[in-house]
């Protein structure tokens, strides 16, 4: 079996503020079994933006059934878009166990905010 | 940490109904699949039945398919197995899961709930 | 459906040796280049525990001396050097369709 690759197919993508993004992600593997997060930034600094395991994400919604069998697929949307959620996402791939420990990110995909039409 | 409770011991009357609850923790309830399994005294594994509480979807043992009904509160994260028509081999333990991988397999289990059937 | 039948039905291995626990599918559970075969460990009174999933990947936690390999319908769980605490019963469980169960495997200590 292949060793999983975490695959972000958009380097970058722009919205217009008030609209919603769609960041894509797909897993070439269901080996490890762990959830997916998504994260602003990198290093230790980074902002949690979805956690498939746990917690409250009100603006953002997963893309495809997540829970059904042989899912890959866990791009998200995020509704609302500002100027302040301009930065590089990055879909992480954990490993199952206590805690889940982080085990591949993808290449991370740029969002730039454009302002409304006046 | 997932954790999965289970309501406590039943004892119930042949033809009887019982309603066995598993509360779970630690993770978000919509996002992974809740099998139930059953054990009869000195017997092996049994496979009940499965639910996504995100849409309620589920699939049976066609043994169980008339008799089992799963659903699942998901203001409470709680899941419920209902066993109609009681009948004295029901004599079990049952047991929640979860499916932490959507492999249709049992990552995380609830310790067991004890329904005795008998007269 | 698939039936999986597990032999033998009881193992008595002594300490440090190693324990083989076979588990055959009635038909291939092989399906989207993955083998859907997991392994359970039950200590009495206690619920099952994962140990293997997919055929062949250790969940996590579980020790490295427990290893499961095979492909289609026949697979194999092994446990290289048997310890006291490996005394259990030992299930395998399909889910190419819905899942079931063997019949389980007791291990004791020889």
């Known amino acids: 079996e292949e060793e999983l690759q975490v695959i972000q197919p958009d380097k970058s993508v722009s919205v217009a503020a008030g609209e919603s993004a769609i960041l894509h992600c797909t897993v070439t593997s269901l080996i490890p079994v762990g959830p997916i997060q998504w994260f602003r930034g990198a290093g230790p600094a980074r902002e949690l933006i979805y956690n498939q395991k746990e917690g409250h994400f009100p603006r953002v919604t997963t893309v495809s059934e997540s829970t059904k069998r042989e899912n890959m697929d866990f791009s998200i949307s995020i509704s609302n878009i500002t100027p302040a959620d301009a930065g590089t996402y990055y879909c992480v791939k954990f490993r199952k166990g206590s805690p889940d420990t982080e085990f591949k990110s993808g290449a991370g995909t740029e969002l730039s905010v454009r302002g409304k039409p006046s | 940490q997932v954790q999965l409770v289970q309501s406590g011991a039943e004892v119930k009357k042949p033809g009887a109904s019982v309603k066995v609850s598993c509360k779970a923790s630690?993770?978000?309830?919509?996002?992974?699949?809740i099998n139930w399994v059953r054990q009869a005294p000195g017997q092996g594994l049994e496979w009940i039945a499965m639910?996504?509480?995100?849409?309620?979807?589920?699939h049976y043992n066609q043994i169980f398919k008339d008799r089992a009904t799963l659903t699942t509160d998901t203001s409470t994260s709680t899941a419920y197995m209902e066993l109609r028509s009681l009948r004295s081999d029901d004599t079990a333990v049952y047991y929640c899961?979860?499916?932490?991988?959507?492999?249709?397999?049992?990552?995380?289990w609830g310790r067991g709930t004890l329904v005795t059937v008998s007269s | 459906d698939i039936v999986l039948t597990q032999s033998p039905d009881s193992l008595a291995v002594s300490l440090g040796e190693r324990a083989t626990i076979n588990c055959r599918a009635s038909q291939s559970v092989r399906s989207s280049g993955y083998n859907w075969i997991f392994w359970y460990q039950q200590k009495p009174g206690q619920p099952p525990k994962l140990l293997i999933y997919?055929?062949?990947n250790r969940d996590s936690g579980v020790p490295d001396r427990f290893s499961g390999s095979g492909s289609g319908t026949d697979f194999t769980l092994t446990i290289s050097s048997l310890q006291a605490e490996d005394v259990a019963v030992y299930y395998c469980q399909h889910s190419r369709e819905l899942p079931t169960f063997g019949q389980g495997t007791k291990l004791e200590i020889k």
């Open positions: 899961a979860m499916d932490y991988g959507s492999l249709y397999a049992m990552d995380y």
């Open positions: 997919l055929a062949s």
């Open positions: 639910i996504d509480p995100s849409d309620s979807e589920t």
């Open positions: 630690g993770y978000t309830f919509t996002n992974y699949w």
